[in-house]
């Protein structure tokens, strides 16, 4: 029978670490990490790490009992967890009978938004105490709410990942800019900033009809030339506070007709907030 892995949590040191080993198995040949999505009962989905590793092909594989993988995550707080993956059989061949190196994977470490992870792996039995054993490590940075997969997570949806404010802005005269955008039921407070190198105008927008999606309009006094300036719209939603996804648009000249601004000149861009 071909070896497979059975993985379980092992946060402390491996028992083998306390034992003296004349020989230890060789190091890993490759270690890779990629995110995978899995459905959860709440109708949402979670992102997990698919950690895969390749064993070096030589006779030292015969000593191999397990591979231990540890993950450290750094964002607002630090996390640390390890799994030990035991091989179910002794290795009878240095490569798979069908060809290629022995490759295994573990899916289970949860991935939080916008977090830097350090993934380390080593074979067991590992080096003796006070000796350096062969190990391998890789970094993995999880994407934020702007990512095409992450944006559908409930946490991201509540932070406005699917909201398109369809910002339009035009220079009415030298002193004012008119900004229009589509509101969202996610919140009722917004901040509109006009930037041209520096902030040349801003306004708080309070939209009381929170349950409905409406088109809001605000006229903002400016202190400099506003044509070509950037409009930044910052929403304030309960789930993300002042760290919600920001959207941008560009100020153009208002047309002379009764239409306040051209609707086809939508420069709305996803902002840079990553919860």
């Amino acid at each position: 029978r071909e070896p497979t892995v059975q993985c379980g949590s092992e946060t402390g040191p491996s028992p083998e670490w306390m034992l003296q080993h004349d020989l230890i198995p060789g190091d890993l040949r490759d270690l890779r990490v990629e995110p995978v999505t899995t459905s959860v009962a709440t109708g949402d989905y979670s992102i997990l790490m698919n950690v895969s590793w390749v064993l070096r092909a030589d006779a030292s594989i015969r000593l191999l009992k397990a591979t231990k993988i540890c993950v450290t995550g750094k964002s607002n707080f630090q996390s640390y967890s390890c799994v030990r993956c035991n091989y179910t059989e002794a290795f009878q061949t240095q490569t798979r009978p069908s060809g290629g190196k022995w490759t295994f994977s573990y899916i289970g470490f949860p991935v939080e938004l916008n977090t830097v992870y350090f993934i380390g792996a080593h074979n067991i039995p590992n080096a003796n105490m006070n000796e350096d054993g062969p190990s391998m490590s890789v970094n993995f940075t999880s994407p934020g709410c702007l990512d095409h997969i992450m944006k559908y997570k409930k946490k991201c949806v509540k932070a406005g990942s699917l909201w398109d404010p369809n910002i339009t802005a035009c220079k009415k005269n030298e002193e004012t800019v008119e900004v229009n955008f589509t509101t969202t039921p996610l919140g009722n407070r917004y901040m509109a900033l006009i930037q041209h190198s520096t902030i040349i105008g801003f306004s708080q927008v309070f939209e009381p009809h929170q349950k409905k999606q409406t088109r809001a309009s605000v006229v903002i006094p400016v202190t400099g030339d506003s044509e070509g300036a950037t409009v930044q719209l910052t929403p304030y939603f309960p789930t993300c506070g002042s760290d919600c996804i920001r959207h941008k648009g560009t100020v153009v000249l208002c047309p002379q007709t009764g239409v306040p601004f051209p609707l086809d000149n939508n420069k709305s861009k996803p902002g840079g907030w990553l919860p």
């Epitope: 030589d58 006779a59 060809g99 290629g100």
Partner: antibody
């Protein structure tokens, strides 16, 4: 039945290159590493290197790293060993050898005599 | 690299004799050792692997023992077809190395 059939004897001048082939049959070519071993006249066996036909990973004996090139063609289940900048002391029988488990060599080619002489 | 020291380099024996060849390695190879027999003009033939396991079709008069750094090939009763050169080889990890060989000649 596993068979490894090597190309015929070669006579080369110093500085030239030689390419020896090893055609396999009777097993799945990509499943076993292919090793190359040489034996100078009246001398012992010397491991030159090995190639994994599955992904072309190669490991060399440092002695041959700069002059030996191991390749394979999976479509015809054949491994190759090319040795460049030949010297007279490269005169030897060159063997391909493989095994299904670890690198004990259960199966050998018949050998290819390469003579380097001016 | 692991060094392989094989002894003796040659020996003379008669049919029916018990013959012992030793192989010492420069470091523990955890029984990852093979023995080969080679006759003039022929490719080597695998006799034993993992220090003690007989290769396919190898007569039971051949046996192997040892562990760590010291290994032995024994021919319990030498037959006429056993006159040849014998090599040990480690396969613990590349680079693989062979012993210098032991030539078994007719006394």
């Amino acid at each position: 039945e596993v068979q490894l059939v090597q190309s015929g004897a070669e006579v080369k001048k110093p500085g030239a290159s030689v390419k020896v082939s090893c055609k396999t049959s009777g097993y799945t070519f990509i499943s076993y590493w292919m090793n190359w071993v040489r034996q100078a006249p009246g001398q012992g066996l010397e491991w030159m290197g090995r190639i994994d036909p599955y992904d072309s990973e190669i490991q060399y004996n440092q002695k041959f790293k700069d002059r030996a090139t191991l390749t394979r063609d999976t479509s015809i289940s054949t491994a190759y060993m090319e040795l460049s900048r030949l010297r007279s002391d490269d005169t030897a029988v060159y063997y391909c050898a493989t095994s299904g488990g670890f690198d004990w060599f259960a199966y050998w080619g018949q050998g290819t005599l390469v003579t380097v002489s001016s | 690299d692991i060094q392989m020291t094989q002894s003796p380099s040659s020996l003379s024996a008669s049919v029916g004799d018990r013959v012992t060849i030793t192989c010492r390695t420069s470091e523990n190879i955890y029984s990852n050792l093979a023995w080969y027999q080679q006759k003039p003009g022929k490719a080597p033939k695998l006799l034993l692997y993992d220090a003690t396991n007989l290769g396919d079709g190898v007569p039971s008069r051949f046996s192997g023992s040892g562990s760590g750094t010291d290994y032995t090939l024994t021919i319990s009763s030498l037959q006429p077809e056993d006159f040849a050169t014998y090599y040990c080889q480690h396969f613990w990890g590349p680079p693989y190395t062979f012993g210098g060989g032991t030539k078994v000649e007719i006394k």
